[in-house]
Amino acid sequence: QPNNSLMLQTSKENHALASSSLCMDEKQITQNYSKVLAEVNTSWPVKMATNAVLCCPPIALRNLIIITWEIILRGQPSCTKAYKKETNETKETNCTDERITWVSRPDQNSDLQIRTVAITHDGYYRCIMVTPDGNFHRGYHLQVLVTPEVTLFQNRNRTAVCKAVAGKPAAHISWIPEGDCATKQEYWSNGTVTVKSTCHWEVHNVSTVTCHVSHLTGNKSLYIELLPVPGAKKSAK
């Protein structure tokens, strides 16, 4: 089938399990902590079903006393994962999600990984590094992005409906050409939003309408040829 000309259009982006990270490599580790302190909190959008790696401030592990990851997820008690260098012990409190783990042994790598990010991983993640020179923090407001499923269909005389179902955050829908449109949003308990745009075109020379869905995970356009008005036998351009 052609990519884009079905009477009922549907689209769901498929993402291979990709990895995303904001970590610095060892070359970027600096003894000048002022830059680290200036970058305390980061907003980080991450696509659902990918892997994410979150990093502590770039401080050499030899200077370390304690590393703590504090994880605050919606509707759950705060989870902490701590590593004490002196005794080489790790401790967890209120941590139930097995997909959130240290990347490797914390004495070798202080990074945290989330395997197969889910909507429930939306939240705040903070690494606290205790050193002889003081405490250094890096926090992440993790925003899980969900690609909406997009459909386009015609339901009445020269009226088309474009839906971006269960996206996070809400998608934005626009049309070519512009029509007489009404847009509704439906909010779901898991934090996703369905956006429904219904448009009517009175202008008789509009042949095909295009629904363009803009979203942080990527944009999608679908189009559909408008069906004739019932009873209209012969009409000239």
């Epitope: 052609p2 512009e178 042949s207 095909t208 295009t210």
Partner: antibody, heavy 114, light 107 residues
Framework: QVQLQQPGSELVRPGASVKLSCKAS????????MHWVKQRPGQGLEWIGN????????NYDEKFKSKAIMTVDISSSTVYMHLSSLTSEDSAVYYC???????WGQGTLVTVSA | DVQMIQSPSSLSASMGDIVTMTCQAS??????LHWFQQKPGKAPKLLIS???NLEDGVPSRFSGSRYGTDFTLTISSLEDEDMATYFC?????????FGGGTKLDIK
């Protein structure tokens, strides 16, 4: 898969008429518009008009209103275009197109010659 | 009617070159379009649908993009078999209208 079958060529006399056919298969024939376009040798493409097989609704470009008439036979999933009062200006390849331009027939070469 | 202005009308390029051609709707009309390739004696073949969607089986060296009301077809690394005429088709308004075509030949 979607297929649009057109005869390869038609030779007609000036002043006569010709009825071009386009037989569709591989999709729901009555649910998609069928369009016709004209391509003269070495020239661009011109949209003639379209027909919706489910209701016989037609649209014609102004230029072809007195030249072309489109009809449909649902039983054979075939769309026809009747061209009348032919002149050398009508010598061209005529294509039928469906699925919003995605699928084209192979085209029929109409030659108007005495 | 919406006029589709396509440029250039012809161009010569070498194998491996990057080639671009554009289509623009008259009066800045907001439209959607397809890009086609046509070889002599053959029906046009859909390359890019809806301005930027690469059709199945079309080599990835072809791409389509849109900036406002300007549409561009790019061939990233020209091959021998790409020698053809390329044209756009706007399908938003009746009558559908075509660009004048870009005849591409290999130097």
């Amino acid at each position: 898969q979607v297929q649009l079958q057109q005869p390869g060529s038609e030779l007609v006399r000036p002043g006569a008429s010709v009825k071009l056919s386009c037989k569709a298969s591989g999709y729901t024939f009555t649910s998609y518009w069928m369009h016709w376009v004209k391509q003269r040798p070495g020239q661009g493409l011109e949209w003639i008009g379209n027909i919706f097989p489910g209701s016989d609704t037609t649209n014609y470009d102004e230029k072809f209103k007195s030249k072309a008439i489109m009809t449909v036979d649902i039983s054979s999933s075939t769309v026809y275009m009747h061209l009348s009062s032919l002149t050398s200006e009508d010598s061209a390849v005529y294509y039928c197109i469906t699925y919003t331009g995605a699928y084209w027939g192979q085209g029929t070469l109409v030659t108007v010659s005495a | 009617d919406v006029q589709m202005i396509q440029s250039p009308s012809s161009l010569s390029a070498s194998m491996g070159d990057i080639v671009t051609m554009t289509c623009q709707a008259s009066q800045g009309t907001n439209i959607n379009l397809h890009w086609f390739q046509q070889k002599p004696g053959k029906a046009p073949k859909l390359l890019i649908s809806g301005g930027s969607n690469l059709e199945d089986g079309v080599p990835s060296r072809f791409s389509g993009s849109r900036y406002g009301t300007d549409f561009t077809l790019t061939i990233s690394s020209l091959e021998d078999e790409d020698m053809a005429t390329y044209f756009c088709l706007q399908f938003t308004y009746l009558p559908w209208t075509f660009g004048g075509g870009t005849k591409l030949d290999i130097k």
